[in-house]
């Protein structure tokens, strides 16, 4: 005989759980034990079947979850699952908030990315850092040039995916070139975009010659400027 | 070509449920946020819900949330809209729209492609 | 929520001429990317809307010239340089800034 314990304690890292209203939201928490232990959920520490909210809630024993669609304002609290058997019992807390702000197209900090000169053999980090209300998902474009164009015949410009993420909101993301030679120079462009729209900044590398040894051992490895 | 085509239209009790889908063809459906947008008859134009690229983010009018449901299937090219509890006032014409994409906007960033429509009439 | 404003009500024009609609939203639509983001649409009788600008003042593929879009921050014009018979239609601004995504409430334009 066991008592019950976590079996994917990774997968309950996540504690707080920040959502927009209308989201569907998940708890999960597999567990196992000898006797199989049973699974049951309390909102702000009284049991909770989910009658007196509108669409109800989907409970699935087999995958130790408890499923709420269209989330409103009065779904926020410590939701909590409790896993017992004749052994013993374990839980779990989380908390959920619903966030009711009006979502909006990503935001990028002004200036960045920042327009940069290096000297070829050096490396380079372009940084954008973006705000959001829904998750955004992040690419990095290198503008190219086909057949001596920039430009294809509808006015846009010819562009290449360098690095695509989906990160959280408010971090900083990176694109690192490593050892730039002359061919990485030219524009660069952060394109963040979510639910509601996209939103792009660019910035031009420019990357020189391998400069005097003397004159390079007193100089930094690259130079941001704007 | 990029098409639109909404169904599941129909004449619905107050307090009864139905659900709309969009069928999307001539674009990659599962790279696009998307939209339901309804017009009431001889009315303007009001904003319903959004569902991100993956299906993983989702917004509601006020006047509809929690109550309706926006959802997704990829390997179907479908938008859905599950209408629960309808209301008189929930009786509109209801486009289904394609958002923002993923990847460089050449041209807008979505709001350029609608369906025809279908016609949702709830009443007693 | 952000409302969006539009006048006239009604437009009616004697084809050649030119017809101006205005659109004011209560907030400023101007993003930190530069760019603003109104749109225009016309709505053809019995149809779905029809993009014609998009962010401020760029013409959707296949829009006349004679369409053309301008205004800053809060206080957006559509015009029209010289109105034709299949113009007709109600025009809609809309804010593309932030959900909930809002529209103007229509100018019907009409032939004389």
């Known amino acids: 005989q066991q008592a019950p314990y976590w079996t994917h304690p990774q997968r309950m890292e996540k504690k707080l759980h920040a959502v927009p209203a209308g989201n569907t939201v998940k708890f999960r928490c597999p567990a196992a034990g000898n006797p199989t232990p049973t699974i049951r959920w309390l909102k702000d520490g009284q049991a909770f079947h989910g009658e007196n909210r509108i669409g109800g809630i989907r409970l699935r024993h087999q995958h130790w979850s408890l499923v709420m669609e269209s989330v409103v304002p009065s779904d926020r609290g410590t939701y909590t699952c409790l896993v017992e058997n004749a052994v013993g019992s374990i839980r779990y807390n989380y908390l959920l908030d619903v966030l009711e702000r009006s979502p909006h197209r990503p935001i990028l900090q002004a200036g960045l990315p920042a327009n940069t000169t290096a000297v070829v053999g050096s490396d380079v980090e372009l940084l954008c850092k973006v705000y959001s209300d829904a998750q955004p998902h992040i690419q990095w474009l290198k503008h190219i040039v086909i057949n001596g164009s920039s430009f294809g015949a509808d006015g846009f410009p010819y562009v290449q995916v360098l690095k695509t993420a989906d990160i959280n909101s408010s971090e900083v993301e990176v694109l690192y070139l490593r050892n730039v030679s002359a061919e990485d120079a030219g524009e660069y462009t952060c394109l963040a975009g979510n639910s509601i729209g996209l939103s792009y900044q660019s910035a031009w590398l420019t990357v020189l010659p391998e400069e005097d040894p003397t004159w390079t051992a007193a100089a930094p490895e690259a130079r941001y400027t704007d | 070509e990029v098409q639109l085509l909404e169904s599941g239209g129909g004449v619905v009790q107050p307090g009864r449920s139905l659900r709309l889908s969009c069928a999307a063809s001539g674009f990659t459906f599962s790279s696009y946020a998307m939209h339901w947008v309804r017009q009431a008859p001889g009315k303007g134009l009001e904003w319903v819900a959004v569902?991100?690229?993956?299906?993983?983010?989702?917004y509601y009018a006020d006047s509809v949330k929690g109550r309706f449901t926006i959802s997704r299937d990829n390997s179907k090219n479908t938008l859905s809209l599950q209408m629960n509890s309808l209301r008189v006032e929930d009786t509109a014409i209801y486009y289904c729209?394609?958002?923002?994409?993923?990847?460089?906007?050449?041209?807008?960033?979505?709001?350029?492609?609608w369906g025809q429509g279908t016609m949702v009439t709830v009443s007693s | 929520d952000i409302v969006m404003t539009q006048t006239p009500l009604s437009l009616s024009v004697t084809p050649g001429q030119p017809a101006s609609i205005s659109c004011t939203s209560s907030?400023?639509?101007?993003?930190?990317?530069?760019?603003?983001?109104v749109y225009w649409y016309v709505q053809k009788s019995g149809q779905p809307p029809q993009l014609l600008i998009y962010e401020l003042s760029n013409r959707f593929s296949g829009v006349p010239d004679r369409f053309s879009g301008s205004g800053s921050r809060t206080d957006f014009t559509l015009k029209i340089s010289r109105v034709e018979a299949e113009d007709v239609g109600v025009y809609y601004c809309m804010q593309y800034i932030e959900a909930p995504l809002t529209f103007g409430g229509g100018t019907k334009v009409e032939i004389k």
């Open positions: 569902i991100s690229y993956d299906g993983s983010n989702k």
């Open positions: 907030r400023s639509l101007l993003h930190s990317d530069g760019k603003t983001y």
């Open positions: 729209v394609r958002g923002a994409g993923l990847g460089f906007p050449y041209g807008p960033d979505g709001f350029d492609i």
